[in-house]
């Protein structure tokens, strides 16, 4: 898998988890977010080179396609597979809110 | 949506469904298939500028955090939504076989 | 140039529905709440809710609690406000205004033109 | 909920003079060290437009004849050198607690 247990310990030019911290108030001028005050979002980045983690059929076709038509612009992308949810506290007032938001931390890559 | 619909009938620069004929012979190197010669399998290609038709939470985040930090490297990429199977006939031997190959077409795309 | 433009002065019948729509340009329509507040006729300002673009996060004022709903478009960056269950007490000018983007309850800095409802059999 | 109360309910200042308008809340509305109370005028026909940030914080692009002061639950905004172009209705608004309330205004 694409995963930090991989992709943290090899150098790799590959489509590949790689890790990004996002601080809310300065990386997206979200300033009401009480704790955290940022967290390890990740993204996925990376060539998608002949059969490298291919999702889907197509993507594999595209992938083989690639390889016979070096000229050709139509490649798979390294894209998000697994994604967790963050929690997070604020403020409406005086009243505490917790809000847990799907889809916020990417786990593993995958070509697409 | 970006499928056909819009993306065919608009020059877009952003994601989008593009055409991309494949010739199973030519393109692939697969001289067994009998029928079809080839198929629109197209691709999904394009920026994916803030909002952009973004996938998750992540990639909403991910593309604000871009328009925020307009040098950094972490930004969505545009793949394949939806996908659609495409059926083939090729033999073994003498004998015709029918095959329902899953996810072969893509008919949408996303930024994710 | 920061500007907040609302749908059109809407007639409706009691206990009918309206959904008005506020498009915004001119700033990042995920990086700010957005308020939503009514005054009827000759009178003061209601603050009914707001709704976090990004994640359509919501909050609403009791008053209003179980008739209001806030959604919005980030593809569009266009926020909405439905309001059901009309009657005469709906009669009012509707607005939407920016929060400020301090705090999640803040001050509004940039309002919409406004939005006349109408309730009339 | 905190009732905003606004004094007097209207008011009629002549041109050049001073105009103060105070604004008590039903419990103070200050926390972590800020007053989270705020001003607007709404001129006739118009949208209200944010005067004063944090009870005294005077908001980008208007005027400073405009001034607010206060703290815990009694507020004053006060316009210096008054002039017609300052007619409307002023609200004074709270974001300490849930809901966020306003003033009944002062005209």
């Known amino acids: 898998a694409l995963d930090a247990a991989y992709c943290f310990r090899n150098v790799q030019d590959n489509c590949c988890l790689r890790p990004l911290y996002i601080d809310f108030k300065r990386d997206l001028g979200w300033k009401w977010i009480h704790e955290p005050k940022g967290y390890n979002a990740n993204f996925c980045a990376g060539a998608c080179p002949y059969l490298w983690s291919s999702d889907t059929q197509h993507s594999r076709v595209l992938s083989l396609y690639n390889t016979i038509n070096p000229e050709a612009s139509a490649s798979p992308c390294c894209v998000s597979q697994d994604l967790e949810p963050l929690t997070i506290l604020y403020y409406i007032g005086k009243t505490p809110k917790i809000e847990q938001l799907s889809n916020m931390i990417v786990k593993s890559c995958k070509c697409s | 949506a970006l499928d056909a619909a819009y993306c065919f009938r608009n020059v877009q620069d952003n994601c989008c469904l593009r055409p991309l004929y494949i010739d199973f012979k030519r393109d692939l190197g697969w001289k067994w298939i009998h029928e079809p010669k080839g198929y629109n399998a197209n691709f999904c290609a394009g920026a994916c500028p803030y909002l952009w038709s973004s996938d998750t939470q992540h990639s909403r985040v991910l593309s604000l955090y871009n328009t925020i930090n307009p040098e950094a490297s972490a930004s969505p990429c545009c793949v394949s939504q939806d996908l659609e199977p495409l059926t083939i006939l090729y033999y073994i031997g003498k004998t015709p076989k029918i095959e329902q190959l899953s996810n072969m077409i893509v008919k949408s795309c996303k930024c994710s | 140039e920061v500007q907040l433009v609302q749908s059109g002065a809407e007639v409706k019948k009691p206990g009918a529905s309206v959904k008005v729509s506020c498009k915004t340009s001119g700033y990042i329509f995920m990086k700010y709440w957005m308020n939503w507040v009514r005054q009827a006729p000759g009178a003061g300002l209601d603050w009914m809710g707001q709704i976090f673009p990004a994640w359509g996060m919501t909050n609403y004022n009791e008053m209003f609690e179980g008739r209001v709903t806030l959604t919005a478009d980030t593809s569009t960056s266009t926020a909405y406000m439905e309001l059901s269950s009309l009657r005469a007490g709906d009669i009012a000018v509707y607005y939407c205004?920016?929060?400020?983007?301090?705090?999640?309850?803040?001050?509004?800095?940039?309002w919409g033109q406004g939005t006349l409802v109408t309730v009339s059999s | 909920d905190i009732v905003m109360t606004q004094t007097p309910p209207s008011l009629s200042v002549s041109p050049r003079e001073t105009a103060s308008i105070s604004c008590r809340a039903s419990e103070s509305v200050d926390s972590y060290g800020n007053s989270f109370m705020h001003w607007y005028l709404q001129k006739p026909g118009q949208s209200p437009q944010l005067l004063i940030y944090l009870a005294s914080n005077l908001e980008s692009g208007v005027s400073d004849r405009f001034s607010g002061s206060g703290s815990g639950t009694d507020f004053t905004l006060r316009i210096s050198r008054v002039e017609a172009n300052d007619t409307g209705v002023y609200y004074c608004?709270?974001?300490?607690?849930?809901?966020?309330?306003f003033g009944q205004g002062t005209k």
């Open positions: 608004q709270q974001n300490d607690e849930d809901p966020l309330s």
């Open positions: 205004a920016r929060g400020y983007g301090n705090y999640a309850l803040d001050a509004m800095d940039y």
